[in-house]
């Protein structure tokens, strides 16, 4: 899917109003030096692709988070404010479905979210440069 | 240009109704979200409910549920919020918002409907007041 025209500002609105606050909750215990951001992205575009990677794709050592509020809320938000993104995913989710697994905080997920997080703040600072 | 009108507001006794409208013109009304809030001195600007205007999907405030009640007249553009079974609690300043892309997105709305910063147009707003 091709985020370009994404309403960023009502995506930044609703990571300002609540998601980011699940994402805290999620890790809350977890100090937030405790993982290094290896994941960035350059633009806004680019950081939602990053975003909906992490957040949707299951990865080695953590098999999904699709089912967390904060992930709930972002594919809401994608599918709101970003025209054509809910029928992308139809065929996403039903394999989604198919796999679900039971829910397991595992510090490869804590790790993972922390890149979220890190990926998140940057969404917001579209137009500071990339280090 | 856009309008948001809001009237209906006055001056209730506890246990007493009151039914505010909002009248909307300028814009596409059956795609569009149209949302109360509601704001007392001192505080935040609170959700109270929204109505998408494309399907009728209604959404509540736990403090309001089932006293207050939305709907849509999508012939005359606008949103009514019927409130019965008034508290002191409620006296505020009562407003209307509309947003162009959750009225067609009615069940991902459920978790942001309740947010003010979302909205893109807001009325003048019109003042309630409960007395006890």
């Known amino acids: 899917y091709d985020f370009t025209n994404c309403d960023f500002e009502k995506i930044k609105a609703a990571y300002l109003s609540t998601i980011s606050k699940d994402l805290i909750t999620y890790m809350s215990g977890t100090k937030s030096t405790e993982f290094n951001n290896t994941v960035s992205c350059s633009n806004r575009p680019h950081c939602l692709t990053e975003i909906q990677s992490l957040t949707f794709n299951p990865t080695a050592g953590c098999a999904s988070l699709a089912k967390e509020m904060f992930a709930m809320k972002t594919k809401a938000a994608l599918a709101i404010w970003c025209p054509g993104y809910s029928e992308t995913q139809i065929n996403a989710t039903q394999a989604m479905k198919k796999r679900r697994k039971r829910k397991v905080t595992t510090n490869k997920c804590l790790e993972q979210v922390s890149q979220l997080q890190g990926l998140w703040r940057r969404f917001n600072r579209p137009l500071l440069k990339q280090q | 240009q856009v309008q948001l009108v809001e009237s209906g507001g006055g001056l209730v006794q506890a246990g007493g109704s009151l039914r505010l409208s909002c009248a909307a013109s300028?814009?596409?009304?059956?795609?569009?979200?149209i949302a109360w809030f509601r704001q007392a001195p001192g505080k935040e600007r609170e959700g109270v409910s929204f109505?998408?205007?494309?399907?009728?999907?209604?959404y509540y405030a736990d403090s309001v549920k089932g006293r207050f009640t939305i709907s849509s007249d999508n012939a005359k553009n606008t949103v009514y919020l019927q409130m019965d079974s008034l508290k002191p609690d409620d006296t505020a300043d009562y407003y209307c918002?509309?947003?162009?892309?959750?009225?067609?997105?009615?069940?991902?709305?459920?978790?942001?409907?309740?947010?003010?910063?979302?909205?893109?147009?807001w009325g003048q707003g019109t003042q309630v007041t409960v007395s006890s």
């Open positions: 918002a509309a947003e162009g892309r959750m009225g067609t997105h009615s069940r991902d709305s459920v978790y942001f409907w309740s947010f003010s910063a979302l909205y893109d147009y």
């Open positions: 300028g814009f596409s009304f059956d795609d569009y979200a």
């Open positions: 109505i998408s205007n494309s399907d009728g999907t209604a």
